[in-house]
Amino acid sequence: AIVFIKQPSSQDALQGRRALLRCEVEAPGPVHVYWLLDGAPVQDTERRFAQGSSLSFAAVDRLQDSGTFQCVARDDVTGEEARSANASFNIKWIEAGPVVLKHPASEAEIQPQTQVTLRCHIDGHPRPTYQWFRDGTPLSDGQSNHTVSSKERNLTLRPAGPEHSGLYSCCAHSAFGQACSSQNFTLSIADESFARVVLAPQDVVVARYEEAMFHCQFSAQPPPSLQWLFEDETPITNRSRPPHLRRATVFANGSLLLTQVRPRNAGIYRCIGQGQRGPPIILEATLHLAEIEDMPLFEPRVFTAGSEERVTCLPPKGLPEPSVWWEHAGVRLPTHGRVYQKGHELVLANIAESDAGVYTCHAANLAGQRRQDVNITVATVPSWLKKPQDSQLEEGKPGYLDCLTQATPKPTVVWYRNQMLISEDSRFEVFKNGTLRINSVEVYDGTWYRCMSSTPAGSIEAQARVQVLEKLKFTPPPQPQQCMEFDKEATVPCSATGREKPTIKWERADGSSLPEWVTDNAGTLHFARVTRDDAGNYTCIASNGPQGQIRAHVQLTVAVFITFKVEPERTTVYQGHTALLQCEAQGDPKPLIQWKGKDRILDPTKLGPRMHIFQNGSLVIHDVAPEDSGRYTCIAGNSCNIKHTEAPLYVVDKPVPEESEGPGSPPPYKMIQT
């Protein structure tokens, strides 16, 4: 059976505050717990959600949380269900509202000596107590012809007189808290002797040297006085006018006329009405001088035929706000049609080529008129003057491909080579007219070229194939000086290309024929076994029908390649002793020996007193120091080849003999001792 360890209980709650309905169950099997509100399942929200098996409220809501909550537990194995006791909230709240007129039905019906009732629309639970205020001052019950009914939340004024005029507000407080009226009520009960506005002056904008008129009227019993003041508090009367208002006239009905208005007349004019009783009424109006600024420039516009485009005319700053209109060819544009004005915009729908031209935006107000032109170009799709042609270009010379087109505006031309955009560099140049120049034609320039000519209206393209007429040339040119190893097999290659496959042959420079052990096989000179006599000058000749012949001269040297007779060995030397690194090489021509120590060539002329290189190639280092340790490389070279061999040199401290060691004990390393 399911047992409730903790049941939810009814409780007080505060609107908008946290609350928790507890529910804890115990059952033999797994239990599923959910909540009901008035018999319907409660869905989790951010405001109200299950917390374990309890129901948590982040902010109690008097409308959504009113009703009966019940916790339901279901044993998932047996299906048994148990329900908790019902629980509900006693929600305490207070909510602000306006002060409204309850009696009479409308403000227009409020007359002196009638009863006026105001209601305070602040509500809450428990019912709050109310306090009324006039112009911020508390009103106490039963004083000065008014009564407060807390039950109905009403304030009654009987009878209402001018002394009750003012701003009425209310506040209410309860156990939950306090609230004041969200909107207050202004009660205005006229006193006949107070000045009342009949006609208030309005702001005026006038052009320079024009006239301006302000109207102003008050009424009262007896009639009120009326006075005009300018900004600096100078009174304006027909008898005494300030110097800068010589052309001002005050009429019997209170109107003020200013003629030939100048900039110094601009400013605030005050009309003051004073009744026999009550405060003066001050009404203000401003005289502005009309003005208009210059218009910003338009950028020229390029549009495409068939599209719809808009050009916005920003009106210049001005007072009053300038009116704006568009003209074309001296005619004002209509407000509908294919080319028309909409607001401040020029609209061109389904643009035609004939729409191109100058359009003018006009702006005008009392201060004058301004205009600004915009040049509209209607773009056309390019057409061909000369397409690129399939071309034969000579290798090594400049080559040209044409792409001549015309359109409005001037078209942009781009070139592609094998579908890749050609960017201008030292080899390619695109002229203003669209022609492509290839500065020095290479064999691999033989491919497809495509030019595209574009305007905003569209593009056209054409392609052409370039065939490169190859030069007759050696590929690669043979090395002018080459070595062959004595008594070994050797080959000397020579190859060439041209418009036609060239024939290649070798001959000796002196014109003598090649010995029988030397063969010329398709341009490769082959020596079966090199002899001393094979040294000399040879010529490789490449020729074809259309391009004639070319020659390359090669001097062949026969050499005995370098071998080392003596190579340096790994050497360990006591600090302060002398190190000897031996190196001897043989070959023909006789090799020269150089040493490299610690990644730098040891220049024999700059070795210093501690180092010396012997004629036979050996390197000696006197008074060795730890910094002499490292790898030493012996490099043997002649005009035909180069070989190197290396060995490490270790410099160590001389050990101090220990008692236990006999006088004849050997050192711990293989040493050179000097």
Partner: antibody, heavy 113, light 107 residues
Framework: QVQLVQSGAEVKKPGASVKISCKGS????????MHWLKQAPGQGLEWIGV????????NYNQKFQGRATMTVDKSISTAYMELSRLRSDDTAVYYC??????WGQGTLVTVSS | DVQITQSPSYLSASPGDRITITCRAS??????LAWYQQKPGKANKLLIY???TLQSGVPSRFSGSGSGTEFTLTISSLQPEDFAMYYC?????????FGQGTKVEIK
């Protein structure tokens, strides 16, 4: 002893509705939740939802929300499950179960044009 | 929704064999996994719930273990009446979800 007896097999056309019943006996009907499950031919089991007969409050599997409707008639201790807008993939055996421990014998619903 | 993956789909064994069936959940379901036996023409039978609690009347050769996402059903010594379809089901949250089933056949 606890018994759940379901209504007989049904053959329906696509777009129609079917209403299956499940009568509980041998226990207090309103004190136990009733689950409904589906098993398509050669397939596993799918949970449709659960109804609490006491108030009639329900919890549906999102997959069946809007097409399945679970109700109870407390006076005759019977639970019902109606499936609307039938499709061919609704062909299955439908089970009612009191919790996980007691199952009905199942009702075969065939949807075919 | 919690996905349940059951393996193997088929299992051949002989009477007296010890067998295990595994279920894996796509997220932690604490200990709340149940095991059922299904035979044609018979009502589904609950064997184990809450991972390892034996339903009353179920022989002790059936046992369950695991928590979180990994669970197993073990039948220590298969009897002839144990050859059937077995399903696992999570009951940690609604909607209940089931494994695809394991058919235990006679070898």
């Amino acid at each position: 002893q606890v018994q759940l007896v379901q209504s007989g097999a049904e053959v329906k056309k696509p777009g129609a509705s079917v209403k299956i019943s499940c009568k509980g006996s041998g226990y207090t009907f309103t004190d136990y939740g009733m689950h409904w499950l589906k098993q398509a031919p050669g397939q596993g089991l799918e949970w449709i939802g659960v109804i609490s007969p006491y108030y009639g409050d329900v919890n549906y599997n999102q997959k069946f929300q809007g097409r399945a409707t679970m109700t109870v008639d407390k006076s005759i201790s019977t639970a019902y499950m109606e499936l609307s807008r039938l499709r061919s993939d609704d062909t299955a055996v439908y089970y009612c179960a009191r919790g996980m421990g007691y199952w009905g014998q199942g009702t075969l619903v065939t949807v075919s044009s | 929704d919690v996905q349940i993956t059951q393996s193997p789909s088929y299992l051949s064994a002989s009477p007296g064999d010890r067998i295990t069936i595994t279920c894996r959940a796509s997220q932690s379901i604490s200990k709340y996994l149940a095991w059922y036996q299904q035979k044609p023409g018979k009502a589904n039978k609950l064997l184990i719930y809450s991972g390892s609690t034996l339903q009353s009347g179920v022989p002790s050769r059936f046992s369950g273990s695991g928590s979180g996402t990994e669970f197993t059903l073990t039948i220590s010594s298969l009897q002839p009446e144990d050859f059937a379809m077995y399903y696992c089901q999570q009951h940690n949250e609604y909607p209940w979800t089931f494994g695809q089933g394991t058919k235990v056949e006679i070898k």
